[in-house]
Structures are given as C-alpha cells and as structure tokens.
Interface confidence: medium
Amino acid sequence: LKGQEFAPSHQQVYAPLRADGDKPRAHLTVVRQTPTQHFKNQFPALHWEHELGLAFTKNRMNYTNKFLLIPESGDYFIYSQVTFRGMTSECSEIRQAGRPNKPDSITVVITKVTDSYPEPTQLLMGTKSVCEVGSNWFQPIYLGAMFSLQEGDKLMVNVSDISLVDYTKEDKTFFGAFLL
Amino acid sequence: LKGQEFAPSHQQVYAPLRADGDKPRAHLTVVRQTPTQHFKNQFPALHWEHELGLAFTKNRMNYTNKFLLIPESGDYFIYSQVTFRGMTSECSEIRQAGRPNKPDSITVVITKVTDSYPEPTQLLMGTKSVCEVGSNWFQPIYLGAMFSLQEGDKLMVNVSDISLVDYTKEDKTFFGAFLL
Amino acid sequence: LKGQEFAPSHQQVYAPLRADGDKPRAHLTVVRQTPTQHFKNQFPALHWEHELGLAFTKNRMNYTNKFLLIPESGDYFIYSQVTFRGMTSECSEIRQAGRPNKPDSITVVITKVTDSYPEPTQLLMGTKSVCEVGSNWFQPIYLGAMFSLQEGDKLMVNVSDISLVDYTKEDKTFFGAFLL
C-alpha cells in the first residue's frame, strides 16, 4: 500500500506538487576578500561571487551583502568548502621546544540569521588544529547538512581568519544551498 | 499564496512534474587502478566500479571509460571522496633539516568535459599539503556541490597521484551524482 | 522528446508523484556519549539527539536506540560529520625516536544493518592517521553519499574511539539522511 497516496495524477493529490526545476538554489564561489572590521570573538563573514563562472542563484534565492536569502520555508541542503593556506604555524616553534601548547586552528561556520532572533544560529562548524612544521600548508574544510529554514532566514559563511582563505580558484572555496 | 501554482493534480500544472525515482543517479566505487600514461601537468582520471557492491547507475546515467555521462540537462549534486595513503613524505626529511620547503600534496578534482568546449572545466577541487614525519599516513578528501549541467556533459575524478589512492574498500573512495 | 512522459498533470502520469515536503528526513546532532561495552574489533555506535535544537526527524523517519530507521525504499543521501579531539598521540613519541610506526588513527563509518543480512554493510568510511607532536589536536571527518535503501534498513554511525568525539556542540558532530 506504500505510495498509494501518490496516485496517477488524474486523481486528487492534496499535497502541493512542485516542478523540481523551480526550487530555490544557489552555488556561490570565492572572490578575493576585503578584510573588514569585525567584532572581537566574532568570525568575519566571507563574500561571494553569485553569477560569474560556476556561480548562480535561481528561483528567488538571492545573494546580497554576504548573505543567501531564503525565499521559501522548507528543508534545505546547505554546504560549503573553504580552502585555507598559510605559512608554518607559530605552534611549530613552541612545539619544537617540547612544550605542549594550544594549537593554531582554522574554522568554518555556516550561520543562520533570523531577524526575529537576537542571536545568529550556528548550523555547521568545521574546526581543525593546524600544527605544521617547516613548510607552507594548505587544506580544505568541507561541511554539508540539511536544515529546516524559514522564509526570510539568511545564511552566511564565517571563518576564523579571512587572510588564510584561498580565494584563487572558484573550485576550491564555495558555498551553496538548495531546497529539497 | 506561496505554492498556489502547485495546485491539486487534477488541475493544470504547466511545469513538467517528475517522479523522483526516475531521475538520473549514480554512485560509483573504487577499483584497483591501472596507472596509465597521462599528459604532463594533467592529473590522471580514476576509473570506477559501476554495478557491483554499493555501486549503481540508473535512469540513463551511464558510466563509460572513466566518465559519468549526463543524460539530461538540469541541476546535479556531485560528490566524491578519495582516500589517500602513503609512506612518509619526502618533505619530512627536508623538514627535519630545519628548512622550509614546498610541501608534498594530495589533490582531487571533479572535472566536467563538454564536447563543444576545448578545455575541461574544474568544478570542485580539494587539495591538501602532506608533510608527515616518521610513519605511514592516510586521509580522505571529500567534495560535494551542486552544478548546472547540460545533456552530454561528462564528469570525471582526477587525482594528483594515482598510486596514492586507497582502492581497497568501496566505502573509502567513491564518486556520485544525482539530478535534483 | 525528453520529459514527455511528465505531461501536464491533467493527463495520466503513471510514475507515483510525491510532494517533496512529505519525504522521510532526519538531521541528528551529537549528545554526550555514554561509553558502552562493544565487541572487540567492532567500532562503537554513537547515539544522537533527534528533536532538540537543530535536530529533527520527520515523515516516518524514526530514530531509536542509535539507529535511523528507513521507513520507505528508495535512494537516500546520507551524511555525517564527526569532530574528534585528543591529546598528543603516542605516535609522536615513537616518531621522535626516529622510528617509522603504525600511526594512530581516527575513523568514522556509516553502517547499514538489514535484519535479513547476518553482517552489517559499511556504506561510508572516513579514516585518517593522526600523528601530532606536542599539542592537543582536533579535526572533523565528513562523509556523504547516495545509497539505495530498503524499507526497514537501519543506519548508524560508528567511530574508532568514542572518547575522542567532540560532543560539545550540535554543529560539530551530526548525522542525517533524506529520501531523494
């Protein structure tokens, strides 16, 4: 009997049916970041390319001022990758002296802002200690999951240090969301 | 009024509706790779299992000669994980002498080939420096994002060094795509 | 002729159409783990929050006793991130003596249990060597892919060492699945 409620379409189907092609969707790609003032203990937000190259927004999903604006309530899959790159972390010098220490780290957070809530909500976080010795380093952090969002919610990607973000290629650092 | 255009199905709905179960989909899993000649500065492509174990292709999504062939235009979610493994990187020997150096690295690229374009398009890249000291190492790189593809586009996964790919288990190294 | 079978909905459409909003979906978030007895050579399963905060289950997708229960056959996208954290791995001490060795490691496995099968099936594995020197460390492992599941299948997340899992924040360690 499973699936019986989804009868051939000449019959009544009460749940609203959707053409998949008209669902809100966006894939944003990295651009060179302008370091901006941000509050202490608050990670800066990345800004993004939304229409050139691989980037697009469609079906009322809009990008403005570092935010993806959710046009319709529903369950969304949200993802981002940020590639970081840096010189040898200071951690290594302390390490070589044989003392344990608080490691350097890189962090990505996908954050939801709801105007009616005073505080942003952290949806996803990827955080990694970086303790490299003797060479430059580079590595990605990838995140992705499904969340129930409301019309008007705004999504952004925050990072622990904007100066470590690899902005050189659109395939290395990106951010996207689509209604399921 | 949102969703009003998706009326009960005895009414006219102009957007083409789809049964989700007949959308093109594929999940490919790793097999032992045969190192092949490839052009200098061009990463070799992996080949894949497409029907045994967890692997499948369905609804006209076909796999042939290292490529997933896109049978229908639309927005696809594309993903891959490659697990790499290796012996101590040479980098470590240089490092121990206390000299910074260009690190060894591992890279995965998901590439789109369009016959009418002379150059492949890199959709996704995960790249990581590897500077390990004194032991074998292993680690995955995961990628996933949504892209607008055209009928006839071909997708492949390229890696920086095919000999470092862990081909031993289908759950460690894989590649997939599905129409949203 | 592509898509011709998906005619305006006053015509006959034989494939069962679905409202997207009523598909089985779940996003589970980390809770503090109670170390439990587990068989040697078998990784322990994590348990999860399923209704507080960002966590939810809907449309007959139920969570019980560490398992997500699949209520309907079909193709599902399944994902998880586990953030691990630990003290300096022992590996580093051995390394400093200049001897190559088997590295410490962290592993996440998404496992499918089918009652009619004697053995669980490993769907996804992320495994990483950890050889840190002189500091605490933390890092995520992310996994996600599409699988064909049957009604009654059960999904769980297993880890190599439950004591290393960062259970402090719902955005750091999570597990989800949704019917495509």
Epitope: - | P35, Q37, R85, G86, S163, L164, T168 | K102
Partner: antibody
Framework: QVQLVQSGAEVKKPGASVKVSCKAS????????MHWVRQAPGQRLEWMGW????????KYSQKFQGRVTITRDTSASTAYMELSSLRSEDTAVYYC??????????????WGQGTMVTVSS | AIQLTQSPSSLSASVGDRVTITCRAS??????LAWYQQKPGKAPKLLIY???SLESGVPSRFSGSGSGTDFTLTISSLQPEDFATYYC?????????FGGGTKVEIK
C-alpha cells in the same frame, strides 16, 4: 606481455662493484616503482631499496645505505642497481620487482628472472 | 625493523589437503601484508596483497586473512603445482621485510 628482463650472472672480487640492469616492457615504465630484492643461498628474501621510475626518487634500506645506488633510464625503460664494496656475504640472486604503487606498497606484482652475483676471491 | 615470523618452517602434505601457513608481525601492520610463492630457481610470484586480496590470475584455492599482527595463508585443496616455498612480506613501514618462508613438501 608485462615482463622484467635482467642482465646475466656476474662474478666479482671482494671490494669491487656490480651493476645489474632490469629492462621493463609491456607497461608504462614511469608509472610504477621498481624495487630490488636479494636472496642469499638458502636465505629469506631481503629488500634493498626502490626507485620511483617517474621522478627518480629513491629509498634505500638502512642496511645497504651508502653501498647501493638505484638509477633508471626512462628512455630505455631500464632500472639499474649498483652495489659497491662487495664482500662474500653479498653472494646472492638479485631480483628487480615492480611495485604496483610508488607510495603505499601493495606488494610486488612482476619480478625479473633474477641475476646471480657471486663474490669470490 | 618489523620482524615477520612464519610457521611452520616446513610441512608435508598430500594433494587435496587443506594447508594453512601463519605469519606473525612483531608489531601491528594493519593489512599491509603480501604472500608470495617461490619455486626452486625461480622468482617469487605474488599470490595475495593487502592481506586478503587475491592477485589477478591466481587460483581461488589460495586465500589470505588477518590484520594487525596475525595473518594466514590458506590453500583450500593442495594441487601438485602448489609444492613450493611461501613467503609473507610487510609493506607497512621501512625497511620492507619478508618472513623466513614455509616450505610445502609432498608427503
């Protein structure tokens, strides 16, 4: 077909050097590693070192460090192993063997026929 | 270096017998172990890689198992051409090392 053909038997005096060649055919030489393994009469196999035929990087067993040199000539699809300061205990059959992977060794899938090296005064 | 100890060092068996050879590593080597067959005057031949994967072209009567420190090579039904010496080899860390060998003789 895929094969490795080694040079012929050698007789050397103590203190001399020997250079054994290994010609590859039937596959892309530069896509694999080449290892050298020896076997003294009645003894177990002993790994000496390897070369990444693509980039020429080498790794040697500590036991032979300073005495062994592994090289390759990509134009001739040939690898070479030179062992210097020979002593009587170096009397053995020397094998080249293809490593499927140049990094994480999943064993040696193709072997040469072996070259007998005798060290005798 | 990682030591590999094979047992027995020799065994006598008849055609059709099930034969088991073990290899113990002095420290954990994950699944990084291979098995070879060597006949007198010939080069070794790869049978099993990654502890349990059968090399292409090798008869299915050969199988490998184990992980960590204890490994087994099994010949399910010994054939006349299987009388030879068998070696295990670890490729987990440098230097790569071999076991002492197990000679399988005709009873």
């Amino acid at each position: 077909q895929v094969q490795l053909v080694q040079s012929g038997a050698e007789v050397k005096k103590p203190g001399a050097s020997v250079k054994v060649s290994c010609k590859a055919s039937g596959y892309t030489f530069t896509s694999y590693a080449m290892h050298w393994v020896r076997q003294a009469p009645g003894q177990r196999l002993e790994w000496m070192g390897w070369i990444n035929a693509g980039n020429g990087n080498t790794k040697y067993s500590q036991k032979f460090q300073g005495r062994v040199t592994i090289t390759r000539d990509t134009s001739a699809s040939t690898a070479y192993m030179e062992l210097s300061s020979l002593r009587s205990e170096d009397t053995a059959v020397y094998y080249c063997a293809r490593g499927y992977s140049s990094a994480w060794f999943d064993a040696f899938d193709i072997w040469g026929q072996g070259t007998m090296v005798t060290v005798s005064s | 270096a990682i030591q590999l100890t094979q047992s027995p060092s020799s065994l006598s068996a008849s055609v059709g017998d099930r034969v088991t050879i073990t290899c113990r590593a002095s420290q954990g080597i994950s699944s990084a172990l291979a098995w070879y067959q060597q006949k007198p005057g010939k080069a070794p031949k790869l049978l099993i890689y990654d502890a349990s994967s059968l090399e292409s072209g090798v008869p299915s009567r050969f199988s490998g198992s184990g992980s960590g420190t204890d490994f087994t090579l099994t010949i399910s039904s010994l054939q006349p051409e299987d009388f030879a010496t068998y070696y295990c080899q670890q490729f987990n860390s440098y230097p790569l090392t071999f076991g002492g060998g197990t000679k399988v003789e005709i009873k």
